[in-house]
């Protein structure tokens, strides 16, 4: 799987997830977040050569063909396959609440 | 929606659906495909600037972190999101067979 | 500049809903919380609620509760409020406001505001 | 719900004098969870002062504000023609936010 378990630890041109820190305050101007300061969301990237992680029939068919035609530019993308929520603290004044945000790191990646 | 309705009616530079026709024989070397003999697979291209057609929270903070930060190379990618199946005709023998794959035709795309 | 036009003035028969939308410019509109305060005569100022872009967290005033609804659409830089079930007492000019950035805190930039008038 | 008492709820004063409007809070808001805006007839608020005693950009200098607790003042150092408005003060510091009912005030 391309996750972190397997691409933090390898040099893996190909599709993989990549680490990725955001300070909330610095990178998205998200002052209201008052813990964390930021996280790691990750992000993914890579080449998706044929059958790599593919994540549906139409993929691995555009990753044929790009093998079969070198000069096409229509080739599979590497993108966010797992995610999970990040958990924040803000302040409602001076109330301090807990909110789960969804969808907020990549664990692992796909080639789609 | 980034549709076939929308995308192959205007010349969209960003994320769009693009037209690609696949000839089963030439382009894939799938010589047990009878009928068709080929089918437009489509496929997903162009940037995917700030906010368009965002699928997660991730990738709509991926987004946002690129506006802010325009030298990251982090950036979402723009991928299939509605995928719809092709009828074929094949041959078993001499005894014809239907059969129905799914996730052949992109019908729309998405930035994620 | 930060500009933030609001839908222009409505009317509204009570037990009714009314929707006003808040187009911003000029600024990272996903980076900023948004406001919603009313006006009137009798009342004066009173807040609303507010909601984040982006995750979609909305605050709202225990009064307004059950009967407001705060969106934002991040894909048009556009905030929305709806408030339903109409009375009499809801006749106001309706603004948005942009916050310094807290959840609660000072409005720096305000919307021209909306008239909504409830009559039967 | 924090209550706001603003005094006096009108005044009149000339050109060059030194005006104070008071903001009195229900419960203690602490040293910065306070605003103070202006709004003129027809047109919409302007934030002058936030955290108690932070001047907006493009406030003008003579605007400033102070206090603590419970409460607050803003202060106008010398009085312009164009200051005639409306102050309301506004506390964040618990939900409901709540403005006070305003001071009005006039030039001679």
């Known amino acids: 799987a391309l996750d972190t378990n397997y691409c933090f630890r390898n040099l893996e041109e190909n599709c993989c997830v990549r680490p990725l820190y955001i300070d909330f305050r610095q990178d998205l101007g998200w002052k209201w977040v008052h813990e964390p300061k930021g996280y790691y969301a990750n992000f993914c990237s890579g080449p998706c050569p044929y059958l790599r992680s593919a994540d549906t029939t139409h993929s691995t068919v555009l990753g044929l063909y790009n093998t079969l035609n070198p000069e096409a530019s229509a080739s599979p993308c590497c993108v966010p396959q797992d995610l999970e929520p990040l958990t924040i603290l803000y302040y409602v004044g001076r109330t301090p609440k807990v909110e789960q945000l969804s969808n907020m790191v990549v664990k692992s990646c796909k080639c789609s | 929606a980034l549709d076939t309705n929308y995308c192959f009616r205007n010349l969209e530079e960003n994320c769009c659906v693009r037209p690609l026709y696949i000839d089963f024989r030439q382009d894939l070397g799938w010589k047990w495909v009878h009928e068709p003999k080929g089918y437009y697979a489509n496929f997903c291209s162009g940037p995917c600037p700030y906010l368009r057609s965002a699928d997660t929270t991730h990738s709509t903070v991926l987004g946002l972190y690129n506006t802010l930060n325009p030298e990251a190379s982090a950036s979402p990618c723009c991928v299939p999101q509605d995928l719809e199946p092709l009828t074929i005709l094949y041959y078993v023998g001499r005894t014809p067979k239907v059969e129905q794959l799914s996730n052949m035709v992109v019908k729309s795309c998405k930035c994620s | 500049q930060v500009l933030l036009v609001q839908s222009g003035a409505d009317v509204r028969k009570p037990g009714a809903s009314v929707k006003i939308f808040c187009k911003a410019s000029?600024?990272?509109?996903?980076?900023?919380?948004m406001h919603w305060v009313r006006q009137t005569p009798a009342q004066g100022f009173e807040w609303m609620g507010s909601v984040i872009p982006i995750v979609d967290i909305a605050t709202y005033a225990r009064r307004f509760q059950g009967r407001l609804v705060l969106t934002a659409d991040t894909s048009t830089n556009t905030a929305y409020m709806e408030l339903r079930s109409l009375k009499s007492a809801d006749t106001a000019v309706y603004y948005c406001a942009r916050t310094l950035g807290l959840v609660l805190d000072a409005m720096d930039y305000w919307g021209q505001g909306s008239l909504v008038t409830v009559s039967s | 719900e924090i209550q706001m008492t603003q005094s006096p709820s009108s005044l009149s004063a000339s050109p060059g004098d030194r005006v104070t409007i008071t903001c009195r809070a229900s419960?203690?808001?602490?040293?910065?969870?306070l605003a103070w805006y202006q709004q003129k007839p027809g047109k919409v608020p302007k934030l002058l002062i936030y955290g108690a005693s932070s001047r907006a950009p493009g406030v003008p200098s003579r605007f400033s504000g102070s206090g603590s607790g419970t409460d607050f003042t803003l202060t106008i150092s010398s009085l312009e023609p164009e200051d005639a408005a409306t102050y309301y003060c506004?506390?964040?510091?618990?939900?409901?936010?709540?403005f006070g009912q305003g001071t009005k005030l006039e030039i001679k």
């Open positions: 506004q506390q964040y510091a618990d939900s409901p936010i709540t």
């Open positions: 419960q203690s808001l602490g040293s910065s969870y």
């Open positions: 000029g600024y990272t509109f996903s980076s900023n919380v």
